[in-house]
Structure formats: structure tokens, C-alpha cells
């Protein structure tokens, strides 16, 4: 059942916990068949997704999948938030689920939740430790 529809493999509720000051690559895994679609990144501001212009992006091509990468060099505290990639393919716009970056400011890293806090506030545990799979290929 091989389809030639463009697919963007960002899962719902996907998250990354990252440190301000570090470099980071946010990947949008893209499947396409013949012509590579035009892909862009945007950052959510309420219900609007604001297109990220003048940001460093690149493609990484692999055998069965390609990655459209948004580069953070380095990560800044205000990079915190939700991002979405979109592909234009045969005049169709395909949007991914949003992926959320939780940026910890190194200056306030000492203020990060303690293990006891984590245990008593499980949503923090979820935020800091779950779904931050970042694929280095």
C-alpha cells in the first residue's frame, strides 16, 4: 500500500528538552516520491503559525527518508515554544503536528525542579523526560 503522498513524520505531542546556549537541530522527517516538496518551518503564536524567515535550514537526504532541518546555533531562551513544518506539494499544503521545544536557560538551570518536585508534580516529569527523542543520523 505504498502511497506517493508526501508525509511529515512528526508525532502528536512530540517534545524536546534542550539547553539554552547549545546548538540544536530540529528535524522534520519528510517522505516524498519524485520531486522534493518545498518545506518551511513556522513557530506557533497562539493559533497562528508565523513563518520563520531568515533562519538557517538544510536538507539531509537518506535512503528512504529526508530531513528538513531548522538550525538553532545556539538555542536562545525565547526559542521555547511550538513549531510546525509544512510542505507544499502539487499545490497542496501538508502540515505536520506541532513539536514543542522546552528551553532551559542555563542561568536558571540551578532552579530546575528537584527530584522531589518531579515526583509530586508529574506533569513536570512528563515535560522534562518524555518524548524528547532527537534522531541523529
Amino acid at each position: 500500500k505504498e502511497s506517493c503522498d508526501v508525509q511529515l513524520y512528526i508525532k502528536r505531542q512530540s517534545e524536546h528538552s534542550i539547553l539554552a546556549g547549545d546548538p540544536f537541530e530540529l528535524e522534520c522527517p519528510v517522505k516524498y516520491c519524485a520531486n522534493r516538496p518545498h518545506v518551511t518551518w513556522c513557530k506557533l503564536n497562539g493559533t497562528t503559525c508565523v513563518k520563520l524567515e531568515d533562519r538557517q535550514t538544510s536538507w539531509k537526504e537518506e535512503k528512504n527518508i529526508s530531513f528538513f532541518i531548522l538550525h538553532f546555533e545556539p538555542v536562545l531562551p525565547n526559542d521555547n515554544g511550538s513549531y510546525r513544518c509544512s510542505a507544499n506539494f502539487q499545490s497542496n499544503l501538508i502540515e505536520s503536528h506541532s513539536t514543542t521545544l522546552y528551553v532551559t536557560d542555563v542561568k536558571s538551570a540551578s532552579e530546575r525542579p528537584s527530584k522531589d518536585e518531579m515526583a509530586s508534580r508529574p506533569w513536570l516529569l512528563y515535560r522534562h523526560h518524555h518524548h524528547h527523542h532527537h534522531h541523529h543520523h
Epitope: 500500500k1 502511497s3 508525532k11 528512504n64 510546525r84 503536528h97 527523542h133
Partner: antibody, heavy 121, light 112 residues
């Protein structure tokens, strides 16, 4: 051709742990977009989604059962294992594994034949 | 959790006649990515569920075109244009927009 087959005990005692294995062929669980879910169906009742594992080992659980469930995958063996602790007679059901395809998100396009698990002392 | 309510729960039909099943959700199934993750499954007696329709109206492979799906938001419909004997069974709607993913309670289609 995608096929899935569930295996495990047909009878478990209350409080015991159930371990079910889904052995599949026709796809790889390391391929982007792929996933496997476990779904159950008590006799004569509706379907209930339990857990899902994605290609990158990310996992999702039904919150009503999350504390009792674990799901793991062995990509080399083409297997997904579900464990459910503290079994109770209300957990008597046919347990299915299903192949999660992707069109923007997961949807189930192939199902196993199911295995009936009875919980009784 | 999103509750999926199907109606009717039992649907006696005449061979060759159309049939329609409704599925309503307690929240909109339109996702922020613009897609609506609403699927339909058929479960024939003694068999596993089989995928019929995904994303509201896309027919899964091998599914006869007498089946069709429609709807948006919270109201969805599965239609069989001309019921055949092999269509007997229970039909379930399913939503994949909100976690946890949930099924309807099923509609039993039987021949009059």
C-alpha cells in the same frame, strides 16, 4: 503482505501479570511512520485501545490503564510485547495487536486474529 | 476522553438497499494539522476488525466502493449504497485526534 499474530496465555489468575507478544511480518518497526497498537474487546462488547508504540520507541497509553501497562518492541525479532499487571476478571477479553500506518498520524489498517485471555481463579 | 456515540446500535437492512450509520463525538475531531482522524472498522462475526475508511472518507485498500464516509467536526456518517450479505457484522467508528484514542460502541448490521 502485512500479517500480525498475538500469542500468550489463554488463562491467567487474578493479580497475576499478563504478557502478550505480537509477532508481525511485512513491515519493519524501525521504518518512519510505522507503529503497533494493542486493542482489546471484552466478550460481546466494544473495542478499547490500550497502548501504542511508534517506530522511534515513543509510547502512548490509555490513561485509565497506564499504571498497569508496559509496551516494548524488539525490531530484530519483529515483535511487540504488552504486559498488564494485576489482572482482574474484568480484563477478560480478546486482545488484538494492530499495525499502525501513517497518514498525518497513526491509523490501524491491519489487525491480528486476536487471542482470548480469561482471568479466573 | 472523547466519547464516540453511534446510532443506531442495531440496523436491520434489506439486501440491495442502502444503509447509514451515524457517529458523533463529544469534541471536534479536526486536528490542528487540518486533518480529521476519524476511521471506520467492520467486524464480521467471529473475525478481527477490518479497516474500511480512514481520514473520514478515504477508502482503505480492497474495500468495495459501495462503502463511503462523510462528515466533519463532530458528526460523521458511514454509508453502504447497496447492502450485500457479506456486509453483516458490527461497525465501529474510531477517533485518533485526541489521546486516548477511542472507539464507538458499535452498530450491528443484520439482514431483515
Amino acid at each position: 503482505q502485512v500479517t500480525l499474530k498475538e500469542s500468550g496465555p489463554t488463562l491467567v489468575k487474578p493479580t497475576q501479570t499478563l504478557t502478550l507478544t505480537c509477532t508481525f511480518s511485512g513491515f519493519s518497526l524501525s521504518t518512519f511512520g510505522m507503529g503497533v497498537s494493542w486493542i482489546r474487546q471484552p466478550p460481546g462488547k466494544a473495542l478499547e485501545w490500550l497502548a501504542h508504540i511508534y517506530w522511534d520507541d515513543d509510547k502512548r497509553f490509555n490513561p485509565s490503564l497506564k499504571s498497569r501497562l508496559t509496551i516494548t518492541k524488539d525490531t530484530s525479532k519483529n515483535q511487540v510485547v504488552l504486559t498488564m499487571t494485576n489482572m482482574d476478571p474484568v480484563d477478560t477479553a480478546t486482545y488484538y495487536c494492530a499495525h499502525g500506518n501513517w497518514d498525518g498520524e497513526t491509523y490501524f489498517d491491519y489487525w491480528g486474529q486476536g487471542t482470548l485471555v480469561t482471568v479466573s481463579s | 476522553d472523547v466519547v464516540m456515540t453511534q446510532s443506531p446500535l442495531s440496523l436491520p437492512v434489506t439486501l440491495g438497499q442502502p444503509a447509514s450509520i451515524s457517529c458523533k463525538s463529544t469534541q471536534s475531531l479536526l486536528d490542528s494539522d487540518g486533518k480529521t482522524y476519524l476511521n471506520w472498522f467492520q467486524q464480521r462475526p467471529g473475525q478481527s476488525p477490518r479497516s474500511l475508511i480512514y481520514l473520514v472518507s478515504k477508502l482503505d485498500s480492497g474495500v468495495p466502493d459501495r462503502f463511503s464516509g462523510s462528515g466533519s467536526g463532530t458528526d460523521f456518517t458511514l454509508k453502504i449504497s447497496r447492502v450485500e450479505a457479506e456486509d453483516v457484522g458490527v461497525y465501529y467508528c474510531w477517533q485518533g485526534t485526541h489521546f486516548p484514542w477511542t472507539f464507538g460502541q458499535g452498530t450491528k448490521v443484520e439482514i431483515k
